[in-house]
Interface confidence: medium
């Protein structure tokens, strides 16, 4: 079976004009998933991102997340790239709408 992930992008303000953007994937199966931040379509370097492990969410499906810090005002340059079971998609950051949800 294949259950596509729900994708949730959030922004939280931090100090000195930087914000943390977090991309969460949830309710997906099987466990293998790709999740990374891109700037202008190019994946950010590994050491600028922080990942959570892929863990059960209690419903027979899985969840994970990736976060990075960006300059406030540059949100439109960043997207969260997700690949799962042959499907893929990009999910933007919005400086105005703090939470975006999509389901493939």
């Amino acid at each position: 079976r294949t259950v596509p992930p729900m994708v949730n992008v959030t922004c939280s303000e931090v100090s000195e004009g930087n914000i943390t953007v977090t991309c969460r994937a949830s309710s997906f199966y099987p466990r293998n998933i790709t999740l990374t931040w891109r700037q202008d379509g190019v994946s950010l370097s590994h050491n600028t991102q922080q990942w959570g492990d892929v863990l059960p969410d209690g419903n027979g499906t899985y969840q994970t997340w990736v976060a990075t810090r960006i300059r406030q005002g540059e949100e439109q340059r960043f997207t969260c790239y997700m690949e799962h079971s042959g499907n893929h998609g990009t999910h933007p950051v919005s400086g105005k709408v703090l939470v975006l949800q999509s389901h493939w």
């Epitope: 293998n32 790709t34 991102q49 959570g52 492990d53 059960p56 990736v66």
Partner: antibody
């Protein structure tokens, strides 16, 4: 810094169980999973299996009837047990960390331990 | 299982030359789950390139990777003496998560 160290008997008799431990430092067992890989002398690498941070496991089907991978967070150790060994199980056994964001690649490795199966 | 075939089996080159190593999968592999490792005699492998084209931490930029589908390539633009080793490709697209048989890069 991140370190992984395999340990266990260097010699195991045929039909017995091979037991190895992987002691780690520099990272949390509740944050990173571990792979086990082996390499017969002079040959290539073979993936045995892995354990996730929640304790669930994925095994190579070639080993699934006789392999167990587990974790003891209190000792900072992962373990590998391989039962009913034969001479074909003679190899250097490695544990390696499953890197986050490396898409299940192995970003840090132990130095490996040679296990010889012989009577 | 997905079989990864590396070619050539042995590559003899001199320092300063360009090395091109190939990895062909028996069925399509997501570029996210194709990795390369380097192994020197008596040492454990080390992660070189992850997800087809991304350099792992501390790896010099003379190394690069490319490819998609079933055909992947590792390139070393200008060989240094420390680059002579065995190189393995590895896929985590489908279990069992297999390695290629390796390409030995030796000094000519």
């Amino acid at each position: 810094q991140v370190q992984l160290q395999e340990s266990g008997p260097g010699l195991v008799k045929p039909s017995e169980t091979l037991s190895l431990t992987c002691t780690v430092s520099g990272f949390s067992l509740t944050t990173y999973g571990v792979h086990w890989i082996r390499q017969p002398p002079g040959k290539g690498l073979e993936w045995i299996g892995m354990i996730w941070t929640d304790g669930t496991t994925d095994y190579n089907a070639a080993f699934i009837s006789r392999v167990t991978i587990s974790v003891d967070t209190s000792k900072n150790q992962f373990s590998l047990k391989l039962s009913s060994v034969t001479a074909a199980d003679t190899a250097v056994y490695y544990c390696a960390r499953k890197g986050h964001g490396y898409y299940y690649a192995m970003d840090y490795w132990g130095q490996g331990t040679l296990v010889t199966v012989s009577s | 299982e997905i079989v990864l075939t590396q070619s050539p089996g042995t590559l003899s080159l001199s320092p300063g030359e360009r090395a091109t190593l190939s990895c062909t999968a028996s069925s399509s592999v997501s570029s996210s789950y194709l990795h390369w490792y380097q192994q020197k005699p008596g040492q454990a492998p080390r992660l070189l390139i992850y997800s087809t084209s991304n350099l792992a931490s501390g790896i010099p930029d003379r190394f690069s990777g490319s490819g998609s589908g079933t055909d992947f390539t590792l390139t070393i633009s200008r060989l240094e003496p420390e680059d002579f080793a065995v190189y393995y490709c590895h896929q985590y697209h489908r279990s069992p998560f297999t390695f290629g048989q390796g390409t030995k890069l030796e000094i000519k």
